[in-house]
């Protein structure tokens, strides 16, 4: 029997093909076989089908990187990594996506889901759209909605200072952050660490964080597959 999606455009389509184990998969932007991209799929969280695009877990990867690195992506998809703004922009241009953020620390966990998530193109400096919060972590991303991405060598924030430089990370900074998931791992100094303000504040660096996305209509697609 042929696959439902011979060239899956995201992890949800890979899952609908019958792949239910979390791990590395190849997806194809716009279903185009010439635009292959290796991604890590989370097939378990809240029904699965998520493309993980950020993971922090041990501090082994350096996240204090320049614009070029954040545009392209870096790290090991099985460990700590950033998928890349160019990839995020292309993926979210395929349709309507939702964002999920999973946070864990010393046995505690929290999550945030945003119904509508997109990253603009390079021309917009990868402008963030994030709306429709639900979850237990608190709505910290709302503050960053509408912001362009900033790195230490490309300052697009609204602060007097360079936020990426001040807080040794990169993000859709405003003035400066409520979320700093690309901050310095394990650094509990004010605003310097891996922060999600409305969960653990700015003086605590969270041990584990993942950001992931899947189509907003995934549940409908999943239900259709089960009925079929």
């Amino acid at each position: 029997i042929g696959l439902l999606y011979p060239f899956p455009r995201d992890c949800s389509q890979a899952m609908l093909n019958g792949d239910t184990t979390s791990g590395l998969y190849t997806i194809y932007i716009n279903g185009d076989k010439t635009q292959a991209l290796e991604v890590y799929c989370d097939m378990t969280s809240d029904g699965g089908g998520w493309i993980v695009f950020l993971r922090r877990k041990n501090g082994r990867e350096d996240f204090y990187r320049n614009w070029k690195a954040y545009a392209a992506g870096f790290g090991d998809r099985r460990e700590e990594f950033w998928l890349g703004l160019d990839n995020l922009s292309k993926i979210t241009a395929q349709g309507q996506y939702e964002l999920r953020v999973d946070l864990q620390d010393h046995g505690e966990s929290a999550y945030a889901v945003y119904d509508r998530f997109s990253v603009g193109d390079a021309k917009s400096r990868y402008k963030l759209k994030v709306e429709g919060y639900s979850g237990t972590a608190g709505d910290s991303m709302n503050y960053h909605n509408g912001r362009s991405f900033s790195t230490y060598d490309k300052d697009t924030d609204s602060a007097i200072t360079n936020c990426a430089l001040s807080y040794k990370g990169a993000f859709w900074y405003k003035n400066c952050h409520r979320v700093n998931l690309m901050g310095r791992y394990g650094d509990n100094n004010h605003s310097q660490g891996v922060n999600w303000f409305h969960w653990k504040g700015h003086e605590y660096s969270i041990q584990f964080a993942e950001m992931k996305l899947r189509p907003s209509n995934f549940r409908n697609l999943e239900g259709r597959r089960k009925r079929a």
């Epitope: 709505d139 709302n142 503050y143 909605n145 509408g146 609204s158 602060a159 007097i160 200072t161 405003k174 003035n175 400066c176 952050h177 409520r178 004010h190 605003s191 700015h202």
Partner: antibody, heavy 120, light 107 residues
Framework: QVQLVESGGGLVQPGRSLRLSCAAS????????MHWVRQAPGKGLEWVSG????????YYADSVKGRFTISRDNAKNSLYLQMNSLRAEDTALYYC?????????????WGQGTMVTVSS | DIQMTQSPASLPTPVGDRVTITCRAS??????LNWYQQKPGKAPKLLIY???NLETGVPSRFSGSGSGTDFTLTISSLQPEDFATYYC?????????FGQGTKVDIK
């Protein structure tokens, strides 16, 4: 243009209730968190309460917690403040205010205020 | 709660002079600091947001600076219409708190 108009203020006895309203126009109301800020006669500004765009999250100053309830009706573009167990120290001009974007943000639009006087 | 301390409380100043108002937060607030102007009988008006960003329509003689705990509002050359009370506000965390105000009046 963007506008906020408060109403519902008046003279009320201690222990009684009052409901303030704020009618919004000129912007997509449910996209923005809204707040109430008050100013006692001759005094400074005091933040009272805030509510998220969806109405799902609410916040209160300690001085009003348990007595005041903030709510909104996005279909009517309206914000409300239900004030129960009123005290003399609640006497103030009450302003509703719109945030620039997120919940904890600057207040870029303010109403003209509605006066609440609590006295026997 | 974060306490905001403004100084001075009153500032008699001649027209044309430079005005500097300071605001200090009781804890680190990054740049989550806003400035408002209020004239008698009127609602407050946003001047500066995020410590240094001029609100649309506000004259360029107003400027803001600072980060962390110490912030400044500057009026480069005081105009007659600038006589008012100025408030700082932290929007770092709930409850959002205001300074006690600085009244700028005619000297």
């Amino acid at each position: 243009q963007v506008q906020l108009v408060e109403s519902g203020g008046g003279l009320v006895q201690p222990g009684r209730s009052l409901r303030l309203s704020c009618a919004a126009s000129g912007f997509t109301f449910d996209d923005y968190a809204m707040h109430w800020v008050r100013q006692a006669p001759g005094k400074g500004l005091e933040w009272v309460s805030g509510i998220s765009g969806s109405g799902g999250s609410t916040y209160y100053a300690d001085s009003v917690k348990g007595r005041f309830t903030i709510s909104r009706d996005n279909a009517k573009n309206s914000l409300y403040l239900q004030m129960n167990s009123l005290r003399a120290e609640d006497t103030a001009l009450y302003y509703c205010a719109k945030v620039m974007s997120s919940m904890e943000d600057a207040f870029d639009i303010w109403g003209q205020g509605t006066m609440v006087t609590v006295s026997s | 709660d974060i306490q905001m301390t403004q100084s001075p409380a009153s500032l008699p100043t001649p027209v044309g002079d430079r005005v500097t108002i300071t605001c200090r937060a009781s804890q680190y607030i990054q740049g989550f600091l806003n400035w408002y102007q209020q004239k008698p009988g009127k609602a407050p008006k946003l001047l500066i947001y995020d410590a240094s960003n001029l609100e649309t329509g506000v004259p360029s003689r107003f400027s803001g600076s600072g980060s962390g705990t110490d912030f400044t509002l500057t009026i480069s050359s005081l105009q007659p219409e600038d006589f008012a009370t100025y408030y700082c506000q932290q929007s770092y965390s709930t409850p959002q708190t205001f300074g006690q105000g600085t009244k700028v009046d005619i000297k």
